[in-house]
């Protein structure tokens, strides 16, 4: 194998889901001493940054001031130390939201259920889309895909207290262009005390934020960015 440097981490701040016309920063964390970072968009060269002084910087930021559907897609970054290049980062799926319309999210049999009950979410949008996404707010930002002409079903099956939390849905016009988010639906699952203590709710964000859950330690940051990297990478699989 030709020697290559370890792949950098890539993530978006405040989030990989960006409302149209809002700003987003794509961050790429490589190694101290890297003399050049490149941001690639869908395989094309998007931007180059040559940090100064390189030995004191291990992260660069690429700023997008005005998100739109042309900027939505798959990003990766790569860096160089001397003549040696890194492997490209994992792919970051940058999604533009608040496109066109707002779906309606409902839950059956209702938002308050008992552990073990079967629960189904319904996401409805009357405009031209056939793919829907259900997200549970929280650090791991679970995403489920569903299909239907105007409505998609998301059966959760028999729920446990781990399913508690706030859900929203989106209509998707293509992989990287989503509708406005639905109004949130908070699912409350009651169960016995043992179950509750064993399955705490994911930490959720304030209702008005979709920001990443950033930790303050460097290792924490790396782990968390890797987690978001992974979430974004698997969003569209």
């Amino acid at each position: 194998q030709q020697q290559t440097l370890p792949k950098p981490f890539i993530w978006a701040e405040p989030h990989f889901m960006v409302p149209k016309e809002k700003q987003v920063t794509i961050c790429c964390q490589g190694n101290y001493g890297a003399v050049e970072y490149q941001l690639h968009f869908e395989g094309s060269l998007f931007a180059v940054d040559r940090p100064k002084p390189p030995e004191r910087i291990n992260k660069v930021q690429f700023y997008i001031p005005d998100m739109n559907s042309r900027m939505a897609g798959q990003y990766s970054c790569i860096y160089r130390v001397g003549e040696l290049w890194s492997e490209p980062s994992n792919l970051l799926d940058l999604v533009v939201t608040e496109m066109y319309d707002t779906p309606t999210l409902s839950v059956h049999p209702g938002p308050e259920v008992i552990s073990g009950e079967k629960v189904t979410f319904y996401c409805r949008l009357d405009t031209a889309t056939s793919m829907f996404l259900l997200l549970k707010e929280g650090r791991s930002s679970h995403v489920q895909r569903g299909y239907g002409k105007v409505q998609a079903e998301f059966p959760l099956g028999p729920v446990t207290t781990a399913h508690r939390g706030t859900y929203r849905c989106f209509g998707s016009y293509n992989n990287h262009a989503w509708s406005f988010p639905s109004e949130p639906v908070k699912l409350l699952v009651t169960g016995d005390i043992e179950n509750t203590s064993l399955a705490p709710e994911d930490p959720t964000f304030p209702a008005d934020t979709w920001g990443t859950y950033l930790l303050t330690t460097e290792t924490g940051l790396q782990k968390d960015h890797a987690l978001w990297d992974h979430t974004a990478q698997n969003l569209l699989r």
Epitope: Q1, Q2, T4, K7, E36, Q38, H40, E42, G43, S44, L45, F46, A47, V48, Q74, I78, R80, W85, E87, P88, L91
Partner: antibody
Framework: QVQLQQSGDDLVKPGASVKLSCKAS????????INWIKQRPGQGLEWIGR????????YYNEIFKGKAILTVDSYSNTAYIQLRSVSSEDSAVYFC?????????WGQGITLTVSS | QIVLSQSPAILSASPGEKVTMACRAS?????IHWYQQRPGSSPKPWIY???SLASGVPARFSGSGSGTSYSLTISRVEAEDAATYYC?????????FGGGTKLEMK
């Protein structure tokens, strides 16, 4: 070490289809985009399209849509270009190139000759 | 699409001379890349992202420019530099190449 090994030169009849290959070795195949480039005898370089082996996602130069199909086989670390219904206009050398910090590794090229 | 025009088409130089070749884009591009190609060989990456030298390229080569106007300069030409040089952009679809400048030795 990194290598892109392209299949041998080919002679095909007009109207036929042909599939040319580019076998990668020495790196993580799925992480890097592969571009295909055409060069007619004595002429310049023309970009055909690109593919990312991780997902098979492709982009084409509009003028090659319907003519070229780019595919990958991640098990054998091989990228392919299929040219449909070839004519003398398709007689050229075809290169594959990997995208790192630049188009850092190129195949040696395949000379395709279209002749009856 | 972005059309890249290279000039001159043919450049004759004597060893030790300084030479410059130009690449003009039909609309603004952020980066231009250069390749060297000798007959019967694959293009070799030469200069990338306007001014960075690819691995193994001698320091007598340099690249510069911005917007629609870019250039490749050889400070002191050597016989081994005889080849065709292509400029390219790969930031905007479809990616495009210039028609090439052939550098010949006098």
């Amino acid at each position: 070490q990194v290598q892109l090994q392209q299949s041998g030169d080919d002679l095909v009849k007009p109207g036929a289809s042909v599939k040319l290959s580019c076998k990668a070795s020495g790196y993580t195949f799925t992480s890097y985009w592969i571009n295909w480039i055409k060069q007619r005898p004595g002429q310049g370089l023309e970009w055909i399209g690109r593919v990312v082996p991780g997902s098979g996602r492709t982009y084409y130069n509009e003028i090659f849509k319907g003519k070229a199909i780019l595919t990958v086989d991640s098990y054998s670390n091989t990228a392919y270009i299929q040219l449909r219904s070839v004519s003398s206009e398709d007689s050229a050398v075809y290169f594959c190139a990997r995208v790192g910090g630049y188009w850092d590794y190129w195949g040696q090229g395949i000379t395709l000759t279209v002749s009856s | 699409q972005i059309v890249l025009s290279q000039s001159p088409a043919i450049l004759s130089a004597s060893p030790g001379e300084k030479v410059t070749m130009a690449c003009r884009a039909s609309s603004s591009v952020n980066y231009i890349h250069w390749y060297q190609q000798r007959p019967g060989s694959s293009p070799k990456p030469w200069i990338y992202a306007t001014s960075s030298l690819a691995s193994g390229v001698p320091a007598r080569f340099s690249g510069s420019g911005s917007g629609t106007s870019y250039s490749l300069t050889i400070s002191r030409v050597e016989a081994e530099d005889a080849a065709t040089y292509y400029c390219q952009q790969w930031s905007s679809n479809p990616y495009t190449f210039g028609g090439g400048t052939k550098l010949e030795m006098k």
